[in-house]
């Protein structure tokens, strides 16, 4: 194994793959179809599986990014100069072990995912060999948002990003020079990975609701 600067194993296997090395959404791979004895997934299990599936997709995309540019060697200080306003978990969001608040946290997760959507749109034309996986990550995130919205009681607290603002942000990002576009791609992937991991930790904390079926993978 060789590692990129962010501590990821660059050649680790991606779960939910078919023989062509493409991501297969949870519930659509042959293992899921060919197991009539299995209990249907609960909503919590489905959300857990969906997040893990997206994280596997991000891992594949980061692999391509790190292989074709040296962005993965950039320190966080250098990356911080890029003033993207990417969603990030903080103590006040109620998603950490200390100060955990299920409702506040769920609102933060959904709001954050909605804010990431414009950045996921930006990623769509940024990959050559992993184009389908970039699309799979984007579409799976939309599905994840729908799953989570069904779970949330306080939907009024969720603010949806302004489409006009998103459109101008997208135009601005796409107008950057090549180096900045590579940097932006790397930053988005790293931040999205961190946000999803924070979310998954929190969701597993929610009364320890989520338990994965024995043969769900």
């Amino acid at each position: 194994d060789y590692k990129d600067h962010d501590g990821d194993y660059k050649d680790h296997d991606i779960d939910y793959k078919d023989d062509d090395d493409k991501l297969v959404p949870p519930g659509e791979d042959s293992k899921d179809v060919a197991a009539p004895h299995r209990q249907p997934l609960t909503s919590s299990e489905r959300i857990d599986k969906q997040i893990r599936y997206i994280l596997d997709g991000i891992s594949a995309l980061r692999k391509e990014t790190c292989n074709k540019s040296n962005m993965c060697e950039s320190s966080k200080e250098a990356l911080a100069e890029n003033n993207l306003n990417l969603p990030k978990m903080a103590e006040k969001d109620g998603c950490f072990q200390s100060g955990f608040n299920e409702e506040t946290c769920l609102v933060k997760i959904i709001t954050g995912l909605l804010e990431f959507e414009v950045y996921l749109e930006y990623l769509q034309n940024r990959f050559e060999s992993s184009e389908e996986q970039a699309r799979a990550v984007q579409m799976s995130t939309k599905v994840l948002i729908q799953f989570l919205q069904k779970k949330a009681k306080n939907l009024d607290a969720i603010t949806t990003p302004d489409p006009t603002t998103n459109a101008s942000l997208l135009t601005k990002l796409q107008a950057q020079n090549q180096w900045l576009q590579d940097m932006t791609t790397h930053l988005i992937l790293r931040s999205f990975k961190e946000f999803l991991q924070s979310s998954l930790r929190a969701l597993r904390q929610m009364g320890d609701l989520i338990s994965v079926p024995v043969d769900s993978r």
Epitope: K3, H5, D6, G7, D8, Y9, H12, D13, I51, R52, L55, D56, S59, S75, K76, K88, M89, A90, E91, C95, F96, Q97, S98, E194, F195, Q197, S198, L200, R201, R204, Q205, D208, S211, V212, P213, V214, S216, R217
Partner: antibody, heavy 121, light 110 residues
Framework: EVQLVESGGGLVQPGGSLRLSCTVS????????LSWVRQAPGKGLEWVGY???????WYANWAKGRFTISRDNSKNTLYLQLNSLRAEDTAVYYC???????????????WGQGTLVTVSS | DIQLTQSPSFLSASVGDRVTITCQAS??????LSWYQQKPGKAPKLLIY???TLTSGVPSRFSGSGSGTEFTLTISSLQPEDFATYYC????????????FGGGTKVEIK
């Protein structure tokens, strides 16, 4: 070469406090998840807690409230604050670097040599 | 509260033996399990993660299998340097747990 070096261990009286440090060289610490693990003499590994890149900390039930993990990425250093120490906290304390794919599946792929904390009057 | 139970606690074996250590989780943890080797006076060393993925530099005589609640570490042909203590570590949930590690299995020379 990547290295983790713990320091700050020693003899402390019951009820006392201690701050352990783990200095990391050869990598940018901010990109990694980190953990403290302890091992009492002749016993097995006991997880103390994690600190993730999102700055969240997660502790073992028995460590909550008494132990605090923090990091200073600018100094490439991980810390463990030990309070209200008891005789049963006597152990070698290891810091370890981790990589996480999903949530808590933090594989600890690089460890320090450990620092011994002895709690005794 | 997820608990890991390793068995056996002690195992006497000879060089060349096939050795199997099991780790049982109190609830399903998918494949989110790692195995470590520790020699006396030394820090633990990561052997396997995601239940079956071998860490770089670890000999192929080590293998891991399992998913859900039952996991196995197998050493196909025990070598003199393999006499050590082995620990499993769950990575499914670290909230409301006392320990993420199993109790350990000491592999001794017969």
């Amino acid at each position: 070469e990547v290295q983790l070096v713990e320091s700050g261990g020693g003899l402390v009286q019951p009820g006392g406090s201690l701050r352990l440090s783990c200095t990391v060289s050869g990598i940018d610490l901010s990109s990694y998840d980190l953990s403290w693990v302890r091992q009492a003499p002749g016993k097995g590994l006991e997880w103390v807690g994690y600190i993730y890149t999102d700055s969240s900390t997660w502790y073992a039930n028995w460590a909550k409230g008494r132990f605090t993990i923090s990091r200073d990425n600018s100094k490439n250093t991980l810390y463990l604050q030990l309070n209200s120490l008891r005789a049963e906290d006597t152990a070698v304390y290891y810091c370890a670097r981790g990589s996480t794919d999903y949530a808590f599946d933090t594989r600890l792929d690089l460890w320090g040599q450990g620092t011994l904390v002895t709690v005794s009057s | 509260d997820i608990q890991l139970t390793q068995s056996p606690s002690f195992l006497s074996a000879s060089v060349g033996d096939r050795v199997t250590i099991t780790c049982q989780a109190s609830q399903s943890i998918s494949n989110e399990l790692s195995w470590y080797q520790q020699k006396p006076g030394k820090a633990p060393k990561l052997l396997i993660y995601r239940a079956s993925t071998l860490t770089s530099g670890v000999p192929s005589r080590f293998s891991g299998s399992g998913s859900g609640t039952e996991f196995t570490l197998t050493i196909s042909s025990l070598q003199p340097e393999d006499f050590a203590t082995y620990y499993c570590q769950q990575g499914y949930n670290s909230n409301d747990v006392d320990n993420v590690f199993g109790g350990g299995t000491k592999v001794e020379i017969k």
